[in-house]
């Protein structure tokens, strides 16, 4: 019978025993950068070519006996998750294994960064198809190494790291930490959070997806024949690095940026329990699963967009928070959230010739969080627009006036520290969804696209009565780009997407009182692109 | 220590080179930083990761890492180079005491110095 | 879904020899440890012995020490059980059972997590008697 | 060897009861401990490990708690099915002992 994590990555129309996914990763090549391992175990007999590259730091400790089985272990058992024969994700995917890791499962940041650097090199001298490679080691945050990972990412080569067993937040470790690196943590079958021993998978912000990672058997290097289970985010990030490999194979052409967008957007949704994690972390936590896309072809017509949260501001009064989004992608919309309430929103602006997304503290606040809500929409050419708080009494508004331009978000940022306390709720005029509206005293920014067949519409829902949570959602085949809130009342904490759904947040119920400042809506941003559709039915 | 004594033994004590007075202040304006991982343990002392600035050709890291190991020398201090990046991060490796980070921090190019650390399978 | 099923039980006289096996399907069956737990007639449940997944490293309970031999080969997706100087007090149903478990890395060692016995046979039955 | 004791050796309870029964381990295990649930001429079945944890696919119902020495099983509402035979197991080492059962039968 399929392995429970097999089934769990596999797609439901694709779930017969004899499953071969098509291709099977065998156009890219995958680099493991971990301990020795067993090459002619019959999982990977073959399909895995050790190099010469080794740089490990002596074990520690006077009654280390070094065994090579031990030794091992970690790195075969990952290269058989990836491509073996049996248990592997990408059977057909080819493998190169660089020596970082020794005896005790212990490297240095220094060897991996010879190992990146080794990498590099071998790819200018002989350059091959789409590379992978699968960081199965963490370390606490390193500047230089995450620096090294960036360059390579942009080289074009496509890093899946494991997020982490520290049961801690991944952006304090690296490479986990780094932007460009695909972070994965760990569930297990009944697609909880992964604990081991005392601790468990990281989580946070820093994750961008999650894999089964508990109880995976694979290669052991106790036999050529033996298999065993082993259990991390190392085997999570296998997964990944494995279904990487499938969807470069399947599209060699996909950028850095659109595998991360189709991870996302195939992974299963809203399947952890995210009480597992620290309260303050289960917003930041991206709740998806990774799972093969259901076909090799046909995702190039969708509009993906991903959710990219900032680390928090701090709780100074100027403080402020920036997400980026990736180089190939756009900043559709940008939001602002903060737990106590107190903030002063957020606004898009220029840095470095890209927009960034910035959320501003206000006085008293405990910090923000900027959300910024990123896409990859070709041939786009963005701007925003910005209104002046207004003085008349009917608010501030801002629309996209040049011909063929969109709205796909709304931000508004206020200097008054208590804005809305005392203010009605500002109504958003009918018949005129192509603005953005908002209070009289801020400043109104929306975010105006013109794109090829680029259409958008915007969605509300709003609650007369005060609640914790109002949600909307785009409809299928509609891609969520833009998330507000209406009106900026003070006890909106903020708004952010999760998937295909804007939420906003309110201040518990209990404490709010239901008054006329209680109603609260929602308002979506749904896009579609009929460019990308049309082009991807004449490929087909 | 013996281990630590006996890599020590390797180390070849840079001679006094005629480059070493040419040694230029960094651009004005531009401090660089040194950074350490914040987990004690994990740390690694007497290895440094000297990262030199974007533009940095391999050139300009070796003559970087020459100066670093002629000024250490003068000081008394012995410092092992072991290994000069290009291709990804300009920059290099090295073996020195930790006396040396202020020194180091002052040579040209350089953009930050990271002390080396440990990382784990997972 | 993993099968476990135990044959080699019968009855046999005090002193005799008997060999139970437990034939296993899947790549699962080696990927684990597994334990022979046995249950003499109206009494609880009494681990015998385990074997690791390579065969390298087995445990038995002190009343069969040196009696019994625990076995398995990997070829044929089987464990073993080489009962030898057998006793009166050996007449019980003998179970295979899997003991699920699994490996991860902390703090630069190579950890063992165990779940408990998660899949078993229907049992076999060992009567030990003149 | 570690010895386990489980208490009561017998328990008469009802449907809809809320039951729990006890498991002594003569020295620390840390939360190395299992339950399982047996039927008259069955093989037992695994139902929580690790002391707390609840296998796959074992109703909720079913609840594990305890560190170190003292460890329960709980049924917060039992069902028809539920009356059979429980026993602890410790995996402390790799040699593993059985507590000697505890019976619940229909009052």
């Known amino acids: 019978s399929i392995p429970w994590n097999l089934e769990r990555i596999t797609p439901p129309r694709y779930r017969a025993d004899e499953y071969q996914p098509p291709d099977g990763g065998s156009l890219v090549e995958v680099y493991l950068l971990d301990t020795s391992i067993q090459s002619d175990h019959r999982e990977i007999e073959g399909r895995v070519m050790v190099t010469d590259f080794e740089n490990v730091p002596e074990e520690d400790g006077t009654r280390f006996h070094r065994q090579a089985s031990k030794c091992d272990s970690h790195g075969t058992h990952l290269a058989g998750v990836v491509s073996g024969r049996d248990a592997g994700v990408a059977k057909g995917a080819s493998m190169r294994s660089l020596r970082v890791l020794n005896c005790q499962g212990k490297g240095t940041v220094s060897g991996t960064l010879i190992g990146l650097e080794f990498i590099r090199k071998s790819q200018l001298v002989q350059p091959v198809g789409p590379l992978v490679v699968l960081l199965p080691l963490a370390g606490g945050y390193s500047r230089v190494l995450n620096a090294a990972c960036q360059r390579l990412a942009r080289a074009g080569v496509v890093l899946v790291t494991a997020a982490g067993n520290f049961r801690d937040d991944a952006c304090l470790y690296s490479p986990a930490s780094a932007p460009e690196v695909i972070t994965v943590g760990a569930t297990n079958a009944q697609d909880q959070p992964v604990t081991l021993g005392t601790l468990g998978t990281n989580f946070g912000r820093c994750v961008d997806l999650f894999a089964p990672g508990e109880d995976i058997i694979g290669a052991s290097s106790d036999c050529s024949t033996c298999f065993v289970s082993q259990s991390g985010t190392s085997q999570a990030a296998a997964h990944v690095a494995g279904i990487a490999a499938m969807m470069l194979s399947a599209e060699p052409e996909l950028t850095l940026a659109e595998l991360r967008q189709r991870l996302i957007h195939f992974s299963a949704k809203d399947v952890i329990n995210e009480a597992w994690f620290p309260e303050d972390q289960r917003v930041l936590t991206p709740n998806l699963v990774a799972a093969l896309p259901p076909s090799t072809h046909g995702a190039g017509w969708q509009l993906f967009c991903r959710t990219v949260w900032s680390a928090h501001s701090g709780p100074t009064r100027m403080a402020t928070a920036v997400a980026r989004c990736a180089p190939d992608e756009e900043l559709l919309s940008c939001s602002s959230f903060s737990r106590s309430g107190k903030r002063r929103g957020e606004r898009m602006e220029a840095q470095g010739g890209k927009l960034v997304c910035r959320a501003h503290n206000a006085f008293g606040g405990e910090g923000v969080y900027a959300i910024a809500r990123c896409c990859l929409l070709p041939q786009a050419n963005c701007s925003v627009h910005t209104a002046p708080p207004a003085e008349a009494s009917m608010g501030t508004r801002v629309h996209c006036h040049q011909q063929g331009h969109v709205l796909t978000g709304c931000s508004s940022h206020w200097e008054v520290e208590d804005l809305g306390t005392h203010k009605p709720p500002v109504l958003r005029p009918r018949g005129q969804p192509n603005q953005c509206v908002g209070h009289r005293e801020a400043s109104i920014h929306a975010s105006c696209c013109h794109a090829p067949g680029l259409e958008c519409k915007v969605k509300e829902h709003g609650i007369p009565a005060p609640q914790e949570q109002v949600t909307v959602a785009c409809e299928e085949g509609w891609t969520l780009t833009g998330c507000s809130a209406l009106p900026g009342t003070s006890h909106v904490l903020g708004a952010y997407a999760v998937d295909n759904t804007c939420v906003v947040r309110s201040r518990d119920v209990s404490t709010t009182g239901s008054t006329s400042e209680g109603a609260v809506t929602a308002v979506a941003i749904c896009c579609r692109s009929r460019h990308l559709a049309q082009a991807s039915q004449e490929l087909q | 220590q013996e281990d630590e004594d006996g890599d020590y033994e390797e180390l070849v004590l840079a001679l006094r080179s005629e480059e070493d007075g040419l040694a230029e202040a960094p651009e004005h304006g531009t401090t660089a930083t040194f950074h350490r991982c914040a987990k004690d343990p994990w740390r690694l002392p007497g290895t440094y990761v000297v990262v030199l600035k974007e533009e940095t050709h391999l050139s300009q890291s070796e003559r970087t890492a020459r100066r670093l190991q002629a000024q250490a020398a003068r000081r008394g201090y012995l410092t092992k180079i072991l290994h000069v990046f290009h291709g990804l991060l300009p920059g290099f490796l090295v073996k020195m005491s930790g006396d040396l980070l202020e020194l180091a921090l002052k040579l040209p190019h350089v953009d930050y110095i990271e002390e080396d650390s440990s990382v784990f399978a997972q | 879904e993993v099968q476990l099923v135990e044959s080699g039980g019968g009855l046999v006289q005090p002193g005799g020899s008997l060999r139970l096996s437990c034939a296993a399907s899947g790549i699962t069956f080696s990927s684990y440890w597994m334990s022979w737990v046995r249950q003499a007639p109206g009494k609880g449940l009494e681990w015998v012995a385990n074997i690791k997944q390579d065969g390298s490293e087995k445990y038995y309970v002190d009343s069969v020490k040196g009696r019994f031999t625990i076995s398995r080969d990997i070829a044929k997706n089987s464990l073993y059980l080489q009962m030898n100087s057998l006793r009166a007090e050996d007449t019980a149903v003998y179970y295979c059972?899997?003991?699920?478990?699994?490996?991860?890395?902390?703090?630069?060692?190579?950890?063992?997590?165990?779940?408990?016995?998660?899949?078993w046979g229907q049992g076999t039955t060992v009567t030990v008697s003149s | 060897d570690i010895q386990m004791t489980q208490s009561p050796s017998t328990l008469s309870a009802s449907v809809g009861d809320r039951v729990t029964i006890t498991c002594r381990a003569s020295?620390?295990?840390?939360?190395?401990l299992a339950w399982y649930q047996q039927k008259p001429g069955k093989a037992p079945k695994l139902l929580i490990y690790k002391a707390s944890s609840l296998e796959s696919g074992v109703p909720s119902r079913f609840s594990g708690s305890g560190s170190g020495t003292e460890f329960t099983l709980t049924i917060s509402s039992l069902q028809p099915d539920d009356f059979a035979t429980y026993y602890c197991?410790?995996?402390?080492?790799?040699?593993?002992?059985f507590g000697q059962g505890t019976k619940l039968e229909i009052k």
């Open positions: 059972a899997r003991d699920r478990g699994t490996y991860y890395y902390a703090d630069g060692d190579y950890n063992y997590y165990y779940y408990g016995m998660d899949v």
């Open positions: 197991q410790q995996y402390n080492s790799y040699s593993y002992t």
């Open positions: 020295q620390s295990i840390s939360s190395w």
